[in-house]
């Protein structure tokens, strides 16, 4: 039956650290004037902080960030023919993470 | 200016494959009837398909999925004292991925 599974192992916390994520290169990041083009590649890998912390007052946040420019191809369709151009997109990679206190409302004294 | 950075490397496509993601164990997964408890751990790692394909008509989809039960702690607060219980959450891991054609809307005949 659907309910019969293997023995449940104890769940391990997904610690706060960098993991590989997929970043979608939206066309509007390349050109806001028209949408009559394609971007290649449509997505790339980035390193991002993720995971959880011991309580809700702290969040997994990047403590070190690196900006990485990458070159993409902008493929314009002019009279049904592709014209290849280059464009630069700047990606944000997280290099280090930490469980940091969330900025909460300060008590009024 | 704000936009001056180092030389741009060619962007590499984030291929369609499994990557480690963080899955938040929401309280509603454990008990829909009350919210007067905590769950530990609050999040776990899962394997999920991500990345992009050659065109918009295909999407990165799992071709093989595995259900994995894990045991979490349900910490109920009764009269300001914690009562520890166990609960099982079934996680979905993707084992294999493929760029598959998106099912388009069928024309009404």
């Amino acid at each position: 039956s659907l309910g019969s599974l293997t023995v449940a192992e104890p769940a391990m916390i997904a610690e706060c650290k960098t993991r590989t994520e997929v970043f979608e290169i939206s066309r509007r990041l390349i050109d806001r004037t028209n949408a009559n083009f394609l971007v290649w590649p449509p997505c790339v890998e980035v390193q991002r902080c993720s995971g959880c912390c011991n309580n809700r007052n702290v969040q997994c946040r990047p403590t070190q960030v690196q900006l990485r420019p990458v070159q993409v191809r902008k493929i314009e369709i002019v009279r049904k023919k592709p014209i290849f151009k280059k464009a630069t997109v700047t990606l944000e990679d997280h290099l280090a993470c930490k469980c940091e206190t969330v900025a909460a409302a300060r008590p009024v004294t | 200016s704000l936009g001056s950075l180092t030389v741009a490397e060619p962007a590499m496509i984030a291929e369609c494959k499994t990557r480690t993601e963080v899955f938040e164990i929401s309280r509603r997964l454990i008990d829909r009837t009350n919210a007067n408890f905590l769950v530990w751990p609050p999040c776990v790692e899962v394997q999920r398909c991500s990345g992009c394909c050659n065109n918009r008509n295909v999407q990165c989809r799992p071709t093989q999925v595995q259900l994995r039960p894990v045991q979490v702690r349900k910490i109920e607060i009764v009269r300001k004292k914690p009562i520890f219980k166990k609960a099982t959450v079934t996680l979905e891991d993707h084992l294999a991925c493929k760029c598959e054609t998106v099912a388009a809307a069928r024309p009404v005949t």
């Epitope: 970043f23 939206s26 990041l29 944000e92 | -």
Partner: antibody, heavy 120, light 107 residues
Framework: EVQLVESGGGLVQPGGSLRLSCAAS????????MSWVRQAPEKGLEWVST????????YYADSVKGRFTISRDNAKNSLYLQMNSLRAEDTAVYYC?????????????WGQGTLVTVSS | DIQMTQSPSSLSASVGDRVAITCRAS??????LNWYQQKPGKAPKLLIY???SLQSGVPSRFSGSGSGTDFTLTISSLQPEDFATYYC?????????FGGGTKVEIK
């Protein structure tokens, strides 16, 4: 269709706090830098804060530095502005705006705004 | 901080008129200049970015020019829906700053 909907505004006493939220839809929120811009009654536009797509970089106007904190939750397609130690001069309509990428620093799409009134 | 000065602060014009609004930066900002339109009770709307690029969906009667410190927003033939306040904004460096606005009114 791009949609940005702000909430959390209201009347607050000087020295008090508010948390503004902006719910985004109709675009890949996690790919865009986001900003808060404000407009005092019958005045011009004033940039408040900007956050990078991954949340690792934040920028503030001098007038709010140390009092306001911008943050985002890409899983929830949400942008936030935590406002502490509020002053009368913070009274304004607060707009959230999509700010393109690292080299753009513009305000491409805007929400309808939420009014913050700081008064005793 | 980079100061942005707009002129005139207000102008009266008729439908069909050609209208020009200028924006001057206190230092060179290359082409890092954007223009916005705002109608009463509404959020601003991006018209022109990078000094001369038209935002998608904006009518072609709007155009932008200039580089360095002096910039111009031109409306080639004013339409009834164009009566609004226009703002310039520099995106060269933080703090990001706006001009004081130009109110375009019906003559």
């Amino acid at each position: 269709e791009v949609q940005l909907v702000e909430s959390g505004g209201g009347l607050v006493q000087p020295g008090g706090s508010l948390r503004l939220s902006c719910a985004a839809s109709g675009f890949t929120f996690s790919s865009y830098w986001m900003s808060w811009v404000r407009q005092a009654p019958e005045k011009g536009l004033e940039w408040v804060s900007t956050i990078s797509d991954g949340g690792g970089l934040t920028y503030y106007a001098d007038s709010v530095k140390g009092r306001f904190t911008i943050s985002r939750d890409n899983a929830k397609n949400s942008l936030y502005l935590q406002m502490n130690s509020l002053r009368a001069e913070d009274t304004a309509v607060y707009y959230c705006a999509e700010s393109g990428g690292y080299t753009d620093w513009l305000f491409g799409y805007w929400g309808q705004g939420t009014l913050v009134t700081v008064s005793s | 901080d980079i100061q942005m000065t707009q002129s005139p602060s207000s102008l009266s014009a008729s439908v069909g008129d050609r209208v020009a609004i200028t924006c001057r930066a206190s230092q060179s900002i290359s082409n890092y200049l954007n223009w916005y339109q705002q109608k009463p009770g509404k959020a601003p709307k991006l018209l022109i970015y990078a000094a001369s690029s038209l935002q998608s969906g904006v009518p072609s009667r709007f155009s932008g020019s200039g580089s360095g410190t002096d910039f111009t927003l031109t409306i080639s033939s004013l339409q009834p829906e164009d009566f609004a306040t226009y703002y310039c904004q520099q995106s060269y460096s933080t703090p990001l700053t706006f001009g004081g606005g130009t109110k375009v009114e019906i003559k």
